[in-house]
């Protein structure tokens, strides 16, 4: 058992153009109040019961009268928390709907009139006993800022409020295997009653009636040692009980996804992709139809033709997920190159580039060939965030602006003489050698090592190197 607590911080116009008109006026003063509805993400009830985890209504806020000509400010809020008590375990995953209502206080016949100003919804994961979680949700032009938490009511403790605490029997310490109950240090965790027959050495439980096995043990009561054949495919740490490597559990081992859901390992845990008609962390919530309003954030629900397609949510721009419950972060497309920082501004994606890079996606290396000319017919070659010029014959230097002496590197072999030429260099070969760089010896019988000298060219003639 425990309490879900919701603290509304502000309700007012969201950022961007199109500020909403104030809901109240001098002629029609009004005040706000809020309603919260919770559904468990891990309960069969969620589809049938609108608020299976519970609902709560806030007190009325202070009366507000619009100042003429002024834009709608953040509106005055009711005092205090909205509290939704839950009787059983906290489900860990839950759906919420928070509605902002306006109560008009004019001269209505028959009392005040109520109208819904805004509704936001979402699905979240939350451990009981954790800190306040902050959230911002938009509904049209309005923005709601709030915090929420789930806390257990004594004697319950733990992330699901399923462990129990009892006053200490001994003043100094708790019994064997039992921890003090933080924050109630003067109390101890009450022993859980595991499934009957669950091995006290190799099994444990986190909820009454279950039997979970320590590594190296298996079976419904954790009495069967894991087969040594598992040493063939080691995955995890060594087990002292079997003396060999026992596969550590992968998050998808045994497929935690129900109802035909498929399990994908993620860096942190696992994710179930559910068949249509099922949702929840493990696809255990079923029987949902469009009548249950499963699409959040203005998603359009379309009924499917067969049981596998009970419904599908067509999400408005900016939302995704089976139930349009996730805000699309287009930065998850990884659009920015070269270490650029991605910003999803809603109307557009922006990449903030690191020094030395530019372009909408930081794809241009400012040290690269873009806008960088190599002189005298040289070509620019990119590489490693820098650029260099591959110069035409006869030119050198960083930008090929310096006239090079083609003979400086002594390119003519076997004592050939080098002559600079407008199109390159010419080698005049010593007797007995031929080739563009005098690299081929002429055979004593006068035949060359090459198939034939080009017509009109005798071995020993100067040869131009192009």
């Amino acid at each position: 058992a425990g309490v879900f607590e919701l603290q509304i911080h502000s309700f007012g116009p969201g950022p961007g153009p199109g500020a909403p008109r104030s809901p109240c006026s001098a002629r029609l003063p009004c005040r706000l109040f809020f309603r919260v509805c919770l559904k468990p993400g891990l309960s069969e009830e969620a589809a049938e019961s609108p608020c299976a985890l519970g609902a709560a209504l806030s007190a009325r806020g202070p009366v507000y009268t619009e100042q003429p000509g002024a834009p709608a400010p953040d509106l005055p809020l009711p005092d205090g928390l909205l509290q939704v008590p839950f009787r059983d375990a906290w489900p860990g995953t839950f759906s919420f709907i928070i509605e902002t209502w306006r109560e008009e206080l004019g001269d209505q016949i028959g009392g005040p009139a109520w109208s819904l100003l805004a509704r936001v919804a979402g699905r979240r994961r939350l451990a009981a006993g954790g800190p306040w979680a902050r959230d911002i949700q938009r509904a049209g032009a309005w923005e709601l800022r709030f915090s929420y938490r789930a806390r257990c009511e004594p004697p319950a403790v733990g992330t699901a409020c399923t462990r129990l605490c009892r006053p200490r029997s001994a003043p100094s310490r708790c019994g064997p295997g039992l921890r003090p109950c933080a924050p109630l240090e003067d109390e101890c965790e009450a022993p859980l009653v595991c499934r009957a027959g669950c091995s006290p050495e190799h099994g444990f439980c986190e909820q009454p009636g279950e039997c979970r096995c320590l590594e190296g043990w298996t079976g419904p009561l954790c009495t069967v040692p894991v087969s040594t054949s598992s040493c063939l495919s080691p995955r995890g740490p060594s087990s002292a009980t079997t003396g060999c490597l026992v596969p550590g559990p992968g998050p998808c081992d045994g497929n935690p996804c129900a109802n035909g859901g498929s399990c994908s390992e993620t860096p942190r845990s696992f994710e179930c992709t559910c068949p249509r008609g099922f949702y929840g962390l493990r696809c255990e919530v079923s029987g949902v139809t469009c009548a249950d309003g499963p699409c959040f954030n203005g998603g359009l629900c379309v009924g499917g033709a067969d049981p596998d397609s009970a419904y599908i949510c067509h999400c408005p721009p900016g939302f995704q997920g089976s139930n349009c419950e996730k805000r699309v972060d287009r930065c998850s497309l990884q659009p920015c190159r070269n270490g650029g920082l991605c910003l999803d501004l809603g109307h557009a994606l922006r990449c903030r580039c690191r020094a030395g890079f530019a372009g909408p996606r930081c794809e241009h290396d400012l040290d690269d060939c873009a806008g960088r000319a190599c002189a005298n017919g040289g070509t620019c070659v990119e590489g490693g965030g820098a650029h260099r010029c591959s110069c035409a014959l006869g030119f050198g230097g960083r930008d090929c602006r310096e006239r090079a002496d083609p003979c400086a590197a002594r390119p003519c072999a076997h004592g050939g003489r080098c002559y600079a030429h407008f199109s390159g260099l010419v080698c005049a070969c010593a007797p007995g050698y031929m080739g563009a760089r005098c690299e081929f010896p002429v055979h004593p019988d006068g035949a060359s090592a090459l198939p034939a000298a080009p017509p009109g060219l005798r071995p020993g003639d100067p040869q131009r190197y192009l």
Epitope: S264, E265, T266, P267, E271, T273, P317, Q320, V328, R330, S332, L333, Q334, P335, C336, R337, A348, C351, P360, R361, E363
Partner: antibody, heavy 117, light 107 residues
Framework: QIQLVQSGPELKKPGETVKISCKAS????????MHWVKQAPGKGLKWMGW????????GYADDFKGRFAFSLETSASTAYLQINNLKNEDTATYFC??????????WGQGTSVTVSS | DIQMTQTTSSLSASLGDRVTISCRAS??????LNWYQQKPDGTVKLLIY???RLHSGVPSRFSGSGSGTDYSLTISNLELEDIATYFC?????????FGGGTKLEIK
């Protein structure tokens, strides 16, 4: 050079599951999101969604919510597409493609999946 | 969703011809318009991205232009190896969408 190599053709029965792989090489796998595209026989290309290769978070187009799952094996520079409870209309060629910020610059050769009883 | 329409589903041209393939979007999408080529063997390659940028290794006879909702791909001097189906795709708004394709054949 940059390459995306996909697993071979698959012949499956309705109701079965198929898992297609796309192995990337020639670049840092986690720097670029991986996208999946479907092409039914004689039809055009249809974008299915993507997976962020850094976080493993997938995003699905509306028509591919439910029975389709994108996943990764980062250590092997491999992306996967799994289709559960196969139907005849899943018969198609499936492509993986690397997104470079503007477009899908590099594509796998495609994997043909045939669903027939 | 943004609808992409390639009104010409097939096109016949002669070698050496200048060929233009058009694509219309149902709404403006900030020049995030790409062109892909699918060869008869099924392989898909990017040709043009961001309306007019030539992908590396693509011959310069391919070019792209357009803005707002109307875009086009031009092949300035048709070669035999250009026989393929060409698809436009918008990459601005999710979900990304493709045109129906234009199949290019030799007369």
């Amino acid at each position: 050079q940059i390459q995306l190599v996909q697993s071979g053709p698959e012949l499956k029965k309705p109701g079965e599951t198929v898992k297609i792989s796309c192995k990337a090489s020639g670049y840092t796998f986690t720097d670029y999101s991986m996208h999946w595209v479907k092409q039914a026989p004689g039809k055009g290309l249809k974008w299915m969604g993507w997976i962020n290769t850094e976080t493993g978070e997938p995003g699905y187009a509306d028509d591919f919510k439910g029975r389709f799952a994108f996943s990764l094996e980062t250590s092997a520079s491999t992306a996967y597409l799994q289709i559960n409870n196969l139907k005849n209309e899943d018969t198609a060629t499936y492509f993986c493609a690397r997104y470079d910020g503007y477009a899908m610059h590099y594509w796998g050769q495609g994997t043909s999946v045939t669903v027939s009883s | 969703d943004i609808q992409m329409t390639q009104t010409t589903s097939s096109l016949s041209a002669s070698l050496g011809d200048r060929v233009t393939i058009s694509c219309r979007a149902s709404q403006d999408h900030s020049n995030y318009l790409n062109w892909y080529q699918q060869k008869p063997d099924g392989t898909v390659k990017l040709l043009i991205y961001y309306t007019s940028r030539l992908h590396s290794g693509v011959p310069s006879r391919f070019s792209g232009s357009g803005s707002g909702t109307d875009y086009s791909l031009t092949i300035s001097n048709l070669e035999l190896e250009d026989i393929a189906t060409y698809f436009c795709q918008q990459g601005d708004m999710l979900p990304w969408t493709f045109g129906g394709g234009t199949k290019l054949e030799i007369k």
